[in-house]
């Protein structure tokens, strides 16, 4: 239904707290360099204006679209051109072009310092002094570093943060209470960020149809007892919600997500038997819970997939009659039978089925042609299964750090032109798949591994797009989203690469490394490892292991020495010489 004042409508639906949080996220995701105080001032102005519209929907400017209102606010910021360069040109455009322009200027890798967590005492003090400002800072800092973070989900993480602080700041040992809990939230939020970025990439590059296919597969796996019409309705609604969030329409997105959660909870009988626990929770927790609810039990009496999609004489007629519906039904039927497959794999199978029908239905005797299609799925299924087995075996043997190093070597050989920081970040993220997925039951490993890897590789592609340096990466990134992971897996050593010359300073370390936190130490060592591979792309695993063991031993020895500086300055050059010899 149309509302006289869109801003009043959203304010009423969302309530002041969520309204302000979402407006802050929106501004922080658009203008990523502005300080919290600058954004907080704008948010207050927008909120005050919204209240005047609630009081009188006919008041001046209350009938304007949210894009117009928000865009006007952003464009009124002083020194916009000095701080944001060509983004200021967006302000010369009219809506909807102006908003599209803002979206195009979102930076996936803003040059902002890493978000450092204050010490427990300091955190608790500022939280107690002003919880609202404290949470505002959290929303601002996360949103500006992750410009596509799913806004209603970020409100959920802020709520989690709030609850943890409320609980831990009352404890005697605040540090040991806060650290593991906040680390847990951070890890989940980072995964949520890359997953959502993948959804927005899907939407931006391949349109709503591609995202809806993803949603049909995912929902069919989770709700195998829901019929196709129900799954289609949920997929359509979910597509709308994600389109809005990816498009910067955060108020509409959060409002529609709440509506979708409400619908699911009112229609549990036709969706799933597993929703009740989620539906008993308050809004943010409810929507989050529904998004990761466990799979419902599969119906016991499902007929073989071949009946309707291979053996039925009407296959080509059904395909001709309503292509998207028929393929959607195939995806639904296949996905509900395979909660053990990744969504990426299910979409590859659906694509293979579509290609088979395109080819076979054009032939003189189609049934003879498409009769073997299910057998042709086998290699497509075996490939990711082997990937999971090989990588989980390696993870179990090496542990997370060793596994990350193995991936780092592999990916540096595949794309040595990519910057070392990007390779290290990618390898560390890819390596976490072991801890995240390899410990799960067998039937949950494949969907966990492949869909997580796809999301991480999407980030690799986004970073590479900014500065394309590797033909290998460009090739894999320009294909369809679901083919990316198999494409990267299939890459081998880049034979066109001219090895980097050996620079001693790259492998020269100082005593300050000793005081770094473990994570930072690992990153330093992994940076050196990537550089070694760039120097000798064809070094054997054994050679690299020898060098890295020597390096670890050197750090251990010098960090324990009484005179660390002398140890580093005398032993360092010896290490560099040994490295060169080992790789000669």
């Amino acid at each position: 239904e149309a509302h006289k004042s869109e801003i009043a409508h959203r304010y009423n639906d969302l309530g002041e707290q969520h309204f302000k949080g979402l407006v802050l996220i929106a501004f922080s995701q658009y203008l990523q360099k502005c300080s919290y105080d600058e954004h907080a001032k704008l948010v207050q102005e927008v909120t005050d204006f919204a209240k005047t519209c609630v009081a009188d929907e006919s008041a001046a400017n209350c009938d304007k679209s949210l894009h117009t209102l928000f865009g006007d606010k952003l464009c009124a910021i002083p020194n916009l051109r000095e701080n944001y360069g060509e983004l200021a040109d967006c302000c010369t455009k009219q809506e909807p072009e102006r908003n599209e322009c803002f979206l195009q200027h979102k930076d996936d890798n803003p040059s902002l310092p890493p978000f450092e967590r204050p010490e427990a005492e300091a955190m608790c003090t500022s939280f107690k002094e002003n919880p609202t400002t404290f949470m505002g800072h959290y929303l601002h800092e996360v949103a500006r570093r992750h410009p596509y973070f799913y806004a209603p989900e970020l409100l959920y993480y802020a709520e989690q943060y709030n609850e943890i602080l409320t609980q831990c700041c009352a404890e005697a040992d605040k540090e040991s209470c806060l650290t593991p809990k906040l680390d847990g939230v951070k890890e989940k939020a980072l995964v949520s960020s890359v997953r959502q970025r993948m959804k927005c990439s899907s939407m931006q590059k391949f349109g709503e149809r591609a995202f809806k296919a993803w949603a049909v597969a995912r929902l069919s796996q989770t709700f195998p007892n829901a019929d196709f019409a129900e799954i289609t309705k949920l997929a359509t609604d979910l597509t709308k919600v994600n389109k809005e969030c990816c498009h910067g329409d955060l108020l509409e997105c959060a409002d529609d997500r709440a509506e979708l959660a409400k619908y699911m909870c009112e229609n549990q009988a036709t969706i799933s038997s597993k929703l009740q626990t989620c539906c008993d929770k308050p809004l943010l927790k409810k929507a989050h819970c529904l998004s990761e609810v466990e799979h419902d039990t599969m119906p016991a009496d499902l007929p073989a997939i071949a009946a309707d999609f291979v053996e039925d004489q009407e296959v080509c007629k059904n395909y001709a009659e309503a292509k998207d519906v028929f393929l959607g039904t195939f995806l639904y039927e296949y996905s509900r039978r395979h909660p053990d497959y990744s969504v990426s794999l299910l979409l590859r199978l659906a694509k293979k089925y579509e290609a088979t029908l395109e080819k076979c239905c054009a032939e003189a005797n189609p049934p003879a042609c498409y009769g073997t299609v299910l057998a042709e799925f086998q290699p497509l299924v075996e490939e990711p299964k082997n990937l999971v087995k090989t990588n989980c075996d390696l993870y179990e043997k090496l542990g997370e750090y060793g596994f990350q190093n193995a991936i780092l070597v592999r990916y540096t050989q595949k794309a040595p032109q990519v910057s070392t920081p990007t390779l290290v970040e990618a390898a560390r993220n890819l390596g976490r798949v072991g801890t995240k997925c390899c410990t799960l039951p067998e039937d949950q490993r494949l969907p966990c591994v492949e869909d997580y890897l796809s999301a991480i590789l999407n980030r690799v592609c986004l970073l590479h797009e900014k500065t394309p340096v590797s033909e290998h990466v460009t090739k894999c990134c320009s294909g369809s989203l679901v083919e990316r992971r198999p494409c990267f897996s299939a890459l081998t050593v880049d034979e066109t690469y001219v090895p980097k010359e050996f620079k001693a300073e790259t492998f020269t370390f100082h005593s300050d490394i000793c005081t770094l936190p473990e994570k930072e130490k690992q990153i330093k060592k992994q940076t050196a490892l990537a550089e070694l591979v760039k120097h000798k792309p064809k070094a054997t695993a054994e050679q690299l292991k020898t060098v890295m063991d020597d390096f670890a031993q050197f750090l251990d020895t010098c960090c324990k020495a009484a005179d660390k500086d002398t140890c580093f300055s005398t032993e360092g050059p010896n290490l560099v010489t040994r490295c060169k010899d080992a790789l000669a």
Epitope: E314, V315, K317, C361, E363, A364, A368
Partner: nanobody, 115 residues
Framework: QVQLQESGGGLVQPGGSLPLSCEAS????????MTWVRWAPGKGVEWVSG????????LYADSVKGRFTISRDNAKNTLYLQMNSLKPEDTAVYYC????????GGQGTQVTVSS
């Protein structure tokens, strides 16, 4: 909505000829292989002939090989079956179908071969 409209049937003497047509609508005709099938009481549905989307490949049942010719005009969304040297056993209702289907979709056209 897919629609197939057969025409051209009638009564013909043994050894005679008949051209059948099938007008198609509601789908992208030029992308689908098409089939002629026939139905006669006591015999059930029998596959007669098939043609690929571009018309570059054709198939025939042994019982009609050398006598029947399948063709298509994608510009007119029309499928044809030229039947020569007709025999009494060719008496049936003839249907065109999409992509090898043996399920008659349209009304069909009656062909009777009798002296």
């Amino acid at each position: 909505q897919v629609q197939l409209q057969e025409s051209g049937g009638g009564l013909v003497q043994p050894g005679g000829s008949l051209p059948l047509s099938c007008e198609a609508s509601g789908f992208t005709f030029s992308r689908f292989g098409m089939t002629w099938v026939r139905w006669a009481p006591g015999k059930g549905v029998e596959w007669v002939s098939g043609i690929s989307s571009l018309g570059d490949s054709t198939l025939y049942a042994d019982s009609v090989k050398g006598r029947f010719t399948i063709s298509r005009d994608n510009a007119k969304n029309t499928l044809y079956l030229q039947m020569n040297s007709l025999k009494p056993e060719d008496t049936a209702v003839y249907y065109c179908t999409i992509g090898g289907s043996l399920n008659p979709g349209g009304q069909g056209t009656q062909v009777t071969v009798s002296s």
